[in-house]
């Protein structure tokens, strides 16, 4: 099971596999989620203790029963890996630290003038693995300024110091926000020279370009195959560096491949995780545990939930099966590669799917028609529900907005398929912020089917709301994850931290936007609102938002979008941009659909369509 | 850390009134929600309402309607359950609690309220 | 509104046992459940819920099924620690309502 929550002054006893120091506890459980052994975790602030040396001390576990004891520790702050926690698992680590110098190896210096200029720099720096900025008011006036890029052996800091005006971060290539680009070609026979920083054993050249990209130092690998002439070395995967951040020389080998890692791609990143099965191969480790069932897939599935277990083998040994039910073998090791691998077998062997994201995890994103009137420019994974709709006619463009609520549906308004029913003739693209970034090569979602609320009539307001199925299921990545939706007892509530998210008109006769826009609205009471749209019936199906002085509201081409509102610390849907009477007026509120009213339609429909429901409701 | 401390135990007469208090600490207050739970001696949960003290909304049982009132003071970070006309079956332990998303991920220690003539 | 049963009011197991704890809504609920586990004189502890999953400090031997308007717990081996007072809550439609509760005891 997935275990989210965090214990405060406490500290597990025992069960060490690994240290190291990190500016927070949210980066410890990362890096423990992606430690092979690691379950559970405890970081030490720099309040929580007096000895320098174990300040900003992260502690990783492994625990057979996956429990350890725990101690009380005053400011001590433990908790779980995350793995099995699908969408949740990401590498990606954007916070800025302020008062903090995390130390290692100094590679580059340089003037700029914000810690976001330095946190891009790193970000774009192949070598670059966190940094530190000395603000204009760092006591030693020939530092201010300072962009300080960093590597360490570990990839985290070698120390963290505390420190008046001085920033410190991560590179966000985790978060595939690289502007160096990455090479994506498989070389076959050819050997790559320079410094191994790691060696494991993979069954082929992908699972080891995964892993490349996972190492904090790895940049680019060479894999013997199974054929390689020297048998002791067959499925090494190599990973390797250099100074210069590329191989200084490659030599033609036979029965070699080599390649790069993908940390530096732009937009995505492969997941962390390796999901082929290998068959007629067997992988051998530590026994976790042995397991009667039938077929392979259901192996994995059960490696998978077992949380220590990393890699699995099935044996189809006539010996090893009675009935339809075969031995699983559950398998771990130290590196979480296996620590043999062979071949000829009747064995089928594969991965625990643990640190996949594209789970259909149960619990919703976390992350902090009609353009946003008033607004600012959004980041890269802010509003990773946000959707655009486009018709593809002579010419493409952007229609509506909508929210992404489970890998197969989107949640749209009713009105924004006013006069274009055709389900071909739409283009719906995920994970996106600039609308210019769409390209012909741009991946796109088309549509399986549109489902437009019974009671909607064009040209009413009422019942503004469509449910759109996708002809396939979308992966869940940094960029592309849906919004929770609300209870149906929700209906009443009050929400005070609002937003609304769409590339329409930043005026009333404007034009469609670029980059992805967002605005912070407070709701308006519908008692409120009627009394501003008097010739119109606001129904409690209907949610207001606005300001009274107007000035910042959505607008042409935001229809369908998001509003989400932050609140018992998750983020929700609360309703669909629907209509208004301008954009950003005096005293005329936005009018949305309120999504809390059609929970029950919104789940039937779903669950009538698929079977079960496929939403990514808090469910 | 999130902690929710209660006020005292309180020994009512019947048709009398209770405030029951709900000092928060280790979160922004308004921020969240906070919501009233009873619990009579020996028997099961019983939700009585809720307040946003971000927004002063508040939700209600219909059972508890016209005789619960809940508060919240910013400037303190605490809320109030005050519960009028009481009646025997009053008695119970009342709890707030704090949710996370929808769930009560934390509680409050309870207080005891019990009616007697 | 809607009315939560949990069919059984108490229970006794040996330690070791797999329990399973019932808890049936009036209505469908849409899998917005959460269970919560009550020690005496204390505060019911939120165990899990479809918001949150399992609350972190229960043991992985809890897991949580159902959909519709049936909902189970279980406990894969029961353990002295696990002796308590269970219910179930539902948060599809206010007002939130719980069921009665199940005491489980060891035999």
């Known amino acids: 099971g997935c275990l989210t929550q965090l214990y405060e002054n406490a500290f597990f006893r025992g069960g060490d596999v690994a240290s190291m120091y990190t500016p927070n506890a949210q980066y410890c459980q990362m890096r423990c989620t992606f430690h092979p052994r690691c379950l559970l975790f405890s970081f030490l602030p720099a309040s929580s203790i007096n000895d320098m040396e174990k300040r900003f001390g992260c502690f990783l576990k492994d625990s057979v029963t996956g429990t350890l004891p725990k101690v009380h520790r005053t400011g001590a702050v433990s908790g779980h890996s995350l793995k099995q926690c699908g969408h949740q698992i990401s590498a990606c680590h954007r916070d800025i630290y302020k008062g903090v110098d995390m130390r290692g190896v100094n590679f580059n210096v340089s003037k700029v003038s914000s810690v976001e200029e330095c946190q891009k720099r790193c970000t774009s720096n192949i070598r670059c693995q966190f940094f530190s900025y000395a603000t204009q008011t760092f006591h030693k006036a020939e530092y201010r300024n300072n962009c300080l890029l960093k590597y360490s052996p570990g990839g985290t800091p070698t120390a963290i110091k505390v420190l008046s005006n001085v920033e410190s971060g991560f590179s966000l290539k985790p978060c595939a926000l690289s502007e160096i680009g990455c090479h994506m070609n498989i070389f076959q026979h050819l050997a790559f020279s320079d410094v191994d920083v790691a060696r494991v054993l993979t069954p082929d050249a992908f699972v080891c370009r995964t892993i490349c990209t996972y190492h904090p130092n790895c940049l680019f690998f060479t894999f013997y195959t199974n054929v390689w002439k020297i048998e002791s070395q067959r499925n090494v995967c190599l990973l390797k560096t250099s100074e210069s951040g590329t191989p200084s020389s490659s030599t033609p080998q036979e029965n070699t491949i080599s390649g790069y890692s993908l940390l530096t791609c732009k937009r995505t990143l492969p997941e962390p995780c390796h999901s082929k099965i290998y068959p007629g191969v067997d992988f051998g480790g530590e026994e976790l545990n042995v397991t009667f069932v039938k077929g392979v897939n259901v192996c994995q599935e059960t490696c998978t939930k077992m949380i220590r277990c990393q890699f699995f083998t099935y044996s189809l040994l006539p010996e090893d099966c009675k009935e339809e039910k075969c031995k699983c073998f559950l398998r771990l090791s130290m590196d979480g590669s296996p620590t043999r691998i062979a071949y000829g077998t009747q064995g089928s062997s594969g991965y625990s799917l643990r640190l996949c994201n594209t789970g259909d995890n149960s619990v919703c994103t976390t992350k902090t028609s009609t353009r946003i009137v008033g607004g600012t420019n959004s980041s890269w994974g802010e509003w990773p529900w946000q959707v655009s709709l486009q018709v593809k006619l002579t010419a493409q463009r952007h229609l509506c907005g909508g929210s992404l609520i489970g890998h197969q549906w989107v949640l749209t308004a009713a009105h924004c398929f006013d006069g274009l029913p055709l389900q071909d003739v739409w283009r719906i693209y995920s994970g996106i912020l600039n609308l210019s970034d769409i390209t012909k090569d741009t991946p796109f979602s088309q549509i399986k089917e549109i489902i437009i609320h019974q009671n909607y009539k064009v040209s009413e307001g009422n019942h503004d709301i469509a449910l759109i199925k996708l002809q396939a299921p979308l992966n869940y990545t940094e960029f592309q994850k849906p919004i929770c939706l609300p209870s149906k007892g929700d209906t009443s509530t009050i929400y005070t931290n609002c937003w609304v998210t769409g590339w329409g008109f930043s005026k009333e006769k404007g034009e469609i936007q670029n980059i992805l826009q967002k605005v912070n609205i407070p709701l308006v009471t519908n008692e409120e609102c009627q009394k501003r749209y008097q010739d119109y019936k606001i129904t409690q199906r209907m949610v207001c938002a606005g300001y009274k002085e107007g000035g910042k509201d959505a607008c042409k081409g935001d229809s369908g979008g998001p509003l989400v509102c932050k609140h018992n610390g998750m983020w929700r849907l609360v309703g669909i941009t629907s209509w208004g009477e301008g954009c950003a007026r005096r005293e005329q509120p936005g009018v949305y659909t309120k999504v809390a009213e059609y929970m029950d339609w919104i789940l039937e429909k779903t669950q009538s369509s698929d079977g079960k429901a496929q939403m990514q409701s808090p469910a | 850390q999130v902690q929710l401390v209660q006020s005292g135990a309180e020994v009512k007469k019947p048709g009398a009134s209770v405030k029951v208090s709900c000092k928060a600490s280790?979160?922004?207050?308004?921020?969240?929600?906070m919501h009233w739970v009873r619990q009579p001696p020996g028997k099961g949960l019983e939700w009585i309402g809720a307040?946003?003290?971000?927004?002063?909304?508040?939700a209600y049982n219909q059972k508890f309607k016209g005789r619960v009132t809940i508060t919240a003071d910013k400037s303190t970070s605490t809320a109030y359950m005050e519960l009028s006309s009481l009646r025997s079956e009053d008695t119970a332990v009342y709890y707030c609690?704090?949710?996370?998303?929808?769930?009560?991920?934390?509680w409050g220690q309870g207080t005891l309220v019990t009616v007697s003539s | 509104d809607i009315q939560m049963t949990q069919s059984s009011s108490s229970f006794s197991g040996s330690l070791g046992d797999r329990v399973t704890i019932t808890c049936k809504a009036s209505?469908?609920?849409?899998?917005?459940l959460a269970w919560y586990q009550q020690k005496p004189g204390n505060a019911p502890r939120l165990l899990m819920s479809?918001?949150?999953g399992l609350e972190a400090g229960f043991h992985l031997r809890f897991s949580g099924s159902g959909s519709g308007k049936d909902y189970t717990l279980s406990i894969a081996s029961l353990q002295t620690e696990d002796v308590a007072t269970y219910y179930c809550?539902?948060?599809?439609?206010?007002?939130?309502?719980f069921g009665g509760g199940t005491k489980l005891e060891i035999k």
């Open positions: 609690a704090r949710p996370y998303g929808y769930p009560f991920a934390y």
């Open positions: 280790g979160y922004t207050f308004t921020d969240y929600e």
């Open positions: 307040i946003h003290p971000g927004s002063g909304g508040t």
């Open positions: 209505e469908d609920i849409y899998n917005r």
């Open positions: 479809g918001e949150t």
């Open positions: 809550q539902q948060y599809w439609s206010t007002p939130w309502t």
